[in-house]
Interface confidence: low
């Protein structure tokens, strides 16, 4: 009698190795004998396919040669005409011996940085990667993190990171090593001792010492008022990733010298620049009497801080006078720099407006210090913190020289708006008024070492700090 | 370090619709597939729905079919499910989880990361 | 639809104690099978996956097993922190279906 079709053995998950054979049995009773069509993932599995072999009616599927690839479900169906088709499904599992597909590279990294090293596998059962630094497994800790994917991550890497790297990809069929990768950490061009400022006799000799540090060993050279030093001698030494320069000087005029520190990191440079001013005694005289000329302000540094077009005075005591004061104010903001968002625009146009005075041009042209008031506003308000700290440094010694002196007015010493109006400058980029101050946080002192006026608004006075420099 | 972070839950009324995503991290949402799983109070947890985006391929649990939809935007690496025609029996914390792979092989790695899960009621 | 029968649906052990407990699908399945604790107001987090793999950072006193339409999870010795809920779960070509879960408690 006919019979409809009846799967008796339900195909079975089958793990199978790569390269190994793997056969699925779907046994049928049925009257008359059915026709029996295999799918893999439901796409149907040809008869002729040279990868397979399809045995006893159809109801034994081998795969001759199992590779990672072949992973799915596969299904058969038999049908004879009698009643509906019947389907059985089951699970091929490609169990494979771990793989490293993407093995680490090795890796040139500026310390700071994030690097990756990649370690990506296949397996299955998947594969567990573990890391191997030197002979030793690595640790992981919060820096450092063996990723899901497997590859290793190592956050703001240090000079000790650098060294050999492999990874470890285990599963219960094997294991297998990537080859040893180095990761190599540079480290940015950084100025260990800074060179120091002198007042000398005129005809003295100076030696000037600047000391770097950096991975590849910096490259040390000086610049004297902008220009490459033209006379005097440099001796230099390196020891343990360390150069020392030493410049020998014969004094004749006052002059800006800066030590500038290089190293490359592929196609960039990082530099580091000291500076340090040598002054002639006989030449210090009274700032009334101080030579210069005014110019419009075309240097980089101060460029969002000073009026567009603004004319500045420039000191002819310096060589170039415009190449000084611009690596004056560069050096001064570098010593200032780890500075909150609110003090910072604010220092950065004090800074700028003293080294950079505005001139009043006439048969004398003469530099305008800032007023009084507006510097207090900046010691006191804006930087309240940052200048206690400056000024614990300077009792301590810890700045160079007076290098800092240049840099930072002493607020007390500048003359005060009332005095003169016209006498003093105001910092176009900082107006305040006692409505804005109600944001800022108590001061440092007990009370302010002046009594902080009502200043008339003016369209020079275009700054106040409001929610952009806001507190919070 | 990978994290799934789920949002959107909330209060809505019978028939409402809701938007929940789930914002990745620490891997990428198109090597991966990603699942929503949902638990309603004091209950076991229930498979919702799952996207593989490197297929665009999609699969739902029948409660749900033809009112959710599962979506993900690679380039946020995020995954979405748009809830609409909401039933009272749709009130559950609604997980989004992560399993290697493509809807073919990521049953066989189990669902390694899990969100925290955002809690969806319906009521009137 | 594929059933997961989970069993039992409770059960309260001492520490130190060895615990199973079993899955039976409703019909011949792969061994895409993954065993979750959950703890209360937290996400399940994944113990074993393919029937019998431990998952990284997983004590090794949990195993997983396989036998026809049966799966297994054997905790060989309970920990106190291992008091929670435990459930299956398999996946066909992505139709996921969980177990009702088994709650372990302290006896």
């Known amino acids: 009698l006919p019979k409809a079709p009846v799967i008796t053995t339900p195909l079975e998950t089958v793990d199978a190795l790569v390269e190994e054979v793997a056969t699925f049995m779907c046994a049928v009773e049925s009257y008359p004998q059915p026709e029996i069509s295999w799918t893999r993932n439901k796409i149907l599995i040809k008869l002729f396919d040279t990868r397979y072999s399809i045995r006893e009616n159809g109801q034994l599927l081998t795969i001759l040669s199992v590779e990672d690839s072949d992973d799915g479900i596969y299904c058969c169906t038999a049908n004879n005409g009698v009643g509906g088709a019947v389907e059985s499904c089951g699970a091929l599992q490609v169990k494979m011996k771990p793989k490293i597909t993407r093995p680490p590279i090795n890796v040139k990294i500026i310390e700071g940085l994030k690097a990756v090293l990649p370690c990506t596998t296949m397996g299955n059962p998947k594969p567990s990667v573990s890391w191997i630094k030197g002979d030793s497994p690595l640790r992981e800790n919060s820096r450092i993190a063996v990723l899901e994917s497997g590859s290793l991550r190592i956050h703001n890497v240090q000079k000790e990171d650098a060294g050999q790297y492999r990874c470890v990809a285990k599963n219960s069929l094997g294991t297998a090593y990537s080859k040893v990768v180095k990761l190599e950490v540079e480290v940015f061009a950084r100025i260990l001792r800074a060179p120091e400022s002198h007042n000398v006799t005129f005809g003295s000799f100076v030696t000037l010492h600047c000391t770097a540090t950096g991975i590849p060993v910096p490259t040390i050279t000086w610049i004297e008022n902008g220009n490459a030093v033209s006379s005097g001698s440099i001796q230099e030494s390196v020891k343990d990733r360390v150069i020392d320069s030493r410049l020998q000087l014969f004094i004749t005029k006052p002059g800006l010298y800066t030590c500038i520190a290089t190293n490359k990191h592929g196609e960039k440079f990082s530099t580091a620049k000291a500076a340090a001013t040598i002054s002639i005694a006989e030449w210090s005289k009274p700032q009334k009497d101080n030579k210069g000329y005014c110019a419009q302000y075309r240097g980089e540094v101060c460029n969002a801080v000073l009026a567009k077009d603004a004319l500045v005075f420039l000191n002819t005591s310096y060589a170039d006078p415009e190449e000084a004061q611009e690596l004056l104010v560069h050096t001064a903001w570098n010593e200032l720099k780890v500075v909150s968002p609110v003090c910072r625009p604010a220092a950065e146009a004090l800074l700028c407006n003293h080294i950079f005075q505005e001139c009043s041009p006439g048969v004398v042209p003469t530099p305008i210090p800032i007023c009084r008031e507006y510097c207090l506003a900046v010691k006191e308000l804006f930087c309240a913190k940052e200048w206690l700290v400056m000024e614990e440094k300077t009792h301590r010694g810890l700045y160079r020289s007076e290098m800092h002196l240049l840099s930072v007015p002493e607020c007390s010493k500048l003359p005060s708006m009332h005095w003169d109006p016209t006498a003093c400058a105001r910092l176009p980029h900082l107006d305040y008024n006692k409505e804005n101050l109600k944001t800022f946080p108590p001061m440092t002192s007990s009370k302010p070492s002046v009594d902080i006026p009502n200043l008339p608004s003016s369209s020079s006075s275009s700054f106040s700090v409001s929610p952009t420099y806001s507190m919070t | 370090e990978v994290q799934l972070v789920e949002s959107g839950g909330g209060l809505v009324q019978p028939g409402g619709s809701l938007r929940l995503s789930c914002a990745a991290s620490?891997?990428?949402?198109?090597?991966?597939?990603i699942h929503w799983v949902r638990q309603a109070p004091g209950k076991g947890l229930e498979w919702v729905a799952s996207?593989?985006?490197?297929?665009?391929?999609?699969s739902y649990a029948d409660s749900v079919k033809g009112r959710f939809t599962i979506s993900a935007d690679t380039s946020k690496n995020t995954a979405y499910l748009q809830m609409n025609s909401l039933r009272a029996e749709d009130t559950a914390v609604y997980y989004c989880?992560?399993?290697?792979?493509?809807?073919?092989?990521?049953?066989?790695?189990?669902?390694?990361?899990w969100g925290q899960g955002t809690l969806v009621t319906v009521s009137s | 639809d594929i059933q997961m029968t989970q069993s039992p649906s409770s059960l309260s052990a001492s520490v130190g104690d060895r615990v199973t407990i079993t899955c039976r699908a409703s019909?011949?399945?792969?061994?895409?099978v993954a065993w979750y604790q959950q703890k209360p107001g937290k996400a399940p987090k994944l113990l074993i996956y393919?029937?019998?793999s431990l998952y990284s950072g997983v004590p090794s006193r949990f195993s997983g097993s396989r036998s026809g339409t049966d799966f297994t999870l054997t905790i060989s010795s309970l920990q106190p922190e291992d008091f929670a809920t435990y459930y299956c779960?398999?996946?066909?070509?992505?139709?996921?279906?969980f177990g009702q879960g088994t709650k372990v408690e302290i006896k």
């Open positions: 989880a992560r399993s290697e792979g493509d809807r073919y092989v990521s049953g066989y790695f189990g669902m390694d990361y």
């Open positions: 620490g891997f990428t949402v198109s090597s991966s597939s």
């Open positions: 996207i593989s985006s490197s297929y665009g391929s999609t």
């Open positions: 019909q011949s399945v792969s061994s895409a």
């Open positions: 393919s029937a019998s």
């Open positions: 779960q398999q996946s066909g070509v992505w139709l996921i279906t």
